[in-house]
Interface confidence: low
C-alpha cells in the first residue's frame, strides 16, 4: 500500500494510473467504500463523501490513463485509505495528514517558550525534528518545546515530520519580540546631554503598549520611575515624567530618551520595560550611565567617576602629552600640587579610552578653568 503524507490546509494529489493510455471509467472511494468521485464519459461525477466540494481530478490527464484524486484544504480527518478502481483493479493509497502549529501566537517575547504542537491522525506514530534559524535541532513527538527564546530564534523554523519512511516539511515563521541590545552603557562628562536609545529588533505594522523606565541611581537607596509612556501605532506619548531629572522622550520609534545633563546623582543603571498589547510579559533593556567629573580644589586635582564601571577599567590623570601621573583601577584619582597646564582625566578599558575630561590648571595664583 502506497503511503502519502499531506499537510493540513494544503492540497494533495493521489495518483491512479491505468495500463491503457486512454480515458476509461474509474472511481475513487474511501475505506468505507463511499464513492468520492469518478467519471461518466468525459464528465466528472461526485459521490456523497464528506470531501465533496474539496475533491477534484484532472480531466486533462484522463486521456493519458491518469486519474488523480485531488483533495484541497486538507484536514486531519481526511487521513484514510483511498481506493482507486480502474480496469478491474484496485490501487490503495494511504493518506496521512499532519498539522503543525505554534502555541497561541508566532510573535513571542524574548525569554518566553515556544511550543510546537503536531496534529496527527489516530494510529500514526510520527517523529518530528525542527531546525531553528540559528541551526539548533530539536526532536520530539506530539509536542516540541523551546524554552527561553532568544533574538536569534527569530525567523523561519523548518520542521520535518517522519512517518513510514516518508517525510513532510513545515515552515513556521517566528518573531521574537526584543530590544536589539539587552544592555548598553553610556559614558558622559558631567554636564553633557545624555541620549539613550532603545531600538527594537523587530518590525510590526501596529505596535501598541506602554512602557516605563525605572532608574537605580548609584547614590540612591531605592529605584525610581523616571518616565512612563504609551505606545499607540508606533506613536509615543509620555504619561508621566519625574521633574528631577526632567527627561524628554521622542514621539516616534525607536524609543529615544534625552537627559538634559549628566550629573553624579544620576549615574547608575536603568531598566526600560515595554509591555505590548495582547502579550503577557514585558520586553526589557538595561541601560547604564557612567558620569565623570574633574575638579581642582586648592592644591588637589581630582578625577572621579560614578556609575556601574567594571573592575578592569582604569582611571588616569595626566598632563597633556606626558605620561600618566596616576593610574588606578579605582573610581577616584588625584594629584596633589599639580603643575600648570592642561590635564586630562581618562577612563579606559584595555587601552581604549571610553571617557575623557580636560581641566586647565593655572599657575597657583589663578583659579582653574574647565573647557
Amino acid at each position: 500500500k502506497k503511503v502519502v503524507l499531506g499537510k493540513k490546509g494544503d492540497t494533495v494529489e493521489l495518483t491512479c494510473t491505468a495500463s491503457q493510455k486512454k480515458s476509461i471509467q474509474f472511481h475513487w472511494k474511501n475505506s468505507n467504500q463511499i464513492k468520492i468521485l469518478g467519471n461518466q464519459g468525459s464528465f466528472l461525477t461526485k459521490g456523497p463523501s464528506k470531501l465533496n466540494d474539496r475533491a477534484d481530478s484532472r480531466r486533462s490527464l484522463w486521456d493519458q490513463g491518469n486519474f488523480p484524486l485531488i483533495i484541497k484544504n486538507l484536514k486531519i480527518e481526511d487521513s484514510d485509505t483511498y481506493i482507486c478502481e480502474v480496469e478491474d483493479q484496485k490501487e490503495e493509497v494511504q493518506l496521512l495528514v499532519f498539522g503543525l502549529t505554534a502555541n497561541s501566537d508566532t510573535h513571542l517575547l524574548q525569554g518566553q517558550s515556544l511550543t510546537l504542537t503536531l496534529e496527527s491522525p489516530p494510529g500514526s506514530s510520527p517523529s518530528v525534528q525542527c531546525r531553528s534559524p540559528r541551526g539548533k535541532n530539536i526532536q520530539g513527538g506530539k509536542t516540541l518545546s523551546v524554552s527561553q527564546l532568544e533574538l536569534q530564534d527569530s525567523g523561519t523554523w523548518t520542521c520535518t515530520v517522519l512517518q513510514n519512511q516518508k517525510k513532510v516539511e513545515f515552515k513556521i515563521d517566528i518573531v521574537v519580540l526584543a530590544f536589539q541590545k539587552a544592555s548598553s552603557i553610556v559614558y558622559k562628562k558631567e554636564g553633557e546631554q545624555v541620549e539613550f536609545s532603545f531600538p527594537l529588533a523587530f518590525t510590526v505594522e501596529k505596535l501598541t503598549g506602554s512602557g516605563e523606565l525605572w532608574w537605580q541611581a548609584e547614590r540612591a537607596s531605592s529605584s525610581k520611575s523616571w518616565i512612563t509612556f504609551d505606545l499607540k501605532n508606533k506613536e509615543v506619548s509620555v504619561k508621566r515624567v519625574t521633574q528631577d531629572p526632567k527627561l524628554q522622550m521622542g514621539k516616534k520609534l525607536p524609543l529615544h530618551l534625552t537627559l538634559p545633563q549628566a550629573l553624579p546623582q544620576y549615574a547608575g543603571s536603568g531598566n526600560l520595560t515595554l509591555a505590548l498589547e495582547a502579550k503577557t510579559g514585558k520586553l526589557h533593556q538595561e541601560v547604564n550611565l557612567v558620569v565623570m567629573r574633574a575638579t581642582q580644589l586648592q592644591k588637589n586635582l581630582t578625577c572621579e567617576v560614578w556609575g556601574p564601571t567594571s573592575p578592569k577599567l582604569m582611571l588616569s590623570l595626566k598632563l597633556e602629552n606626558k605620561e600618566a601621573k596616576v593610574s588606578k583601577r579605582e573610581k577616584a584619582v588625584w594629584v596633589l600640587n599639580p603643575e600648570a597646564g592642561m590635564w586630562q582625566c581618562l577612563l579606559s578599558d584595555s587601552g581604549q579610552v571610553l571617557l575623557e575630561s580636560n581641566i586647565k590648571v593655572l599657575p597657583t595664583w589663578s583659579t582653574p578653568v574647565q573647557p
Partner: antibody
Amino acid sequence: QVQLQQSGPELVKPGASVRMSCKASGYTFTDYVIHWVKQRTGQGLEWIGEIYPGSGSAYSNAKFKDKATLTADKSSNTAYMQLSSLTSEDSAVYFCARRGNGTGFAYWGQGTLVTVSA
Amino acid sequence: DIVLTQSPASLAVSLGQRATISCKAGQSVDYDGDSYMNWYQQKPGQPPKLLIYVASNLESGIPARFSGSGSGTDFTLNIHPVEEEDAATYYCQQSYKDPLTFGAGTKLELK
C-alpha cells in the same frame, strides 16, 4: 464601552478603615492607569494617587501617603483603595478615573460616598 | 505642588453670551510643545466630565461651543454661545507633574 463601577456608600466610625472598589469593563484593564480623586461636599477635587494594574505599581500624592493604599486585582479587573485611621476630614465622595487618549480623565466612576461619624 | 488659581469663583452669563474662565498655574505646565492642562465640567451629584485636554483639544462628544486656549502658565476656557445645560462648576487640572492638581472651581450660573 468603557465603564468604571464603584462600590456603594459607606458609613464608618472614626479611627476605622474602609476599602472601596472600582470595577473596570469595556477595555483591557492592564493597559490603563486607574486614578483616585477625593471631593469633599461642596469642595473642589484632590488627586489621591494612581495604580498601574499591570504591575501593581502605585504612586500617591504625598498628602495621602499614610492615608490611602491603592491595589489592583487583574483577575477581576478591579482597583481598590483602602483609607485608614478615618477622621471627619475623610468624609467625602471618592471617584476612580481613567485617562482617555489625551492626558485628561475621560472616564469616571459614579463615586463612593464615605461618611465618618461616631 | 503646582497651584492652579481659577477666576472668577463664580459668574452669571445670559443665554447665548460668552463665558470666559481663567486658570493660572504656579509654574509652566508645558512639555515638549504641549501644555498639560485639562478642563472639566461638573454638575451636582455627578462625576466631572472631561471637556478639553492638552489645553485646546476637544474631547470627543463635547459640543464645539467649548474651547480651550493658552500655554505656559495662563489658560482659558471659553463657552460660546452659552446654553441652559452649561450651568455647572468648571475645573482646570494640570497633568504635567505629580501630584496632579485641580483648580478650586468656577461656578457658572445663567442670568
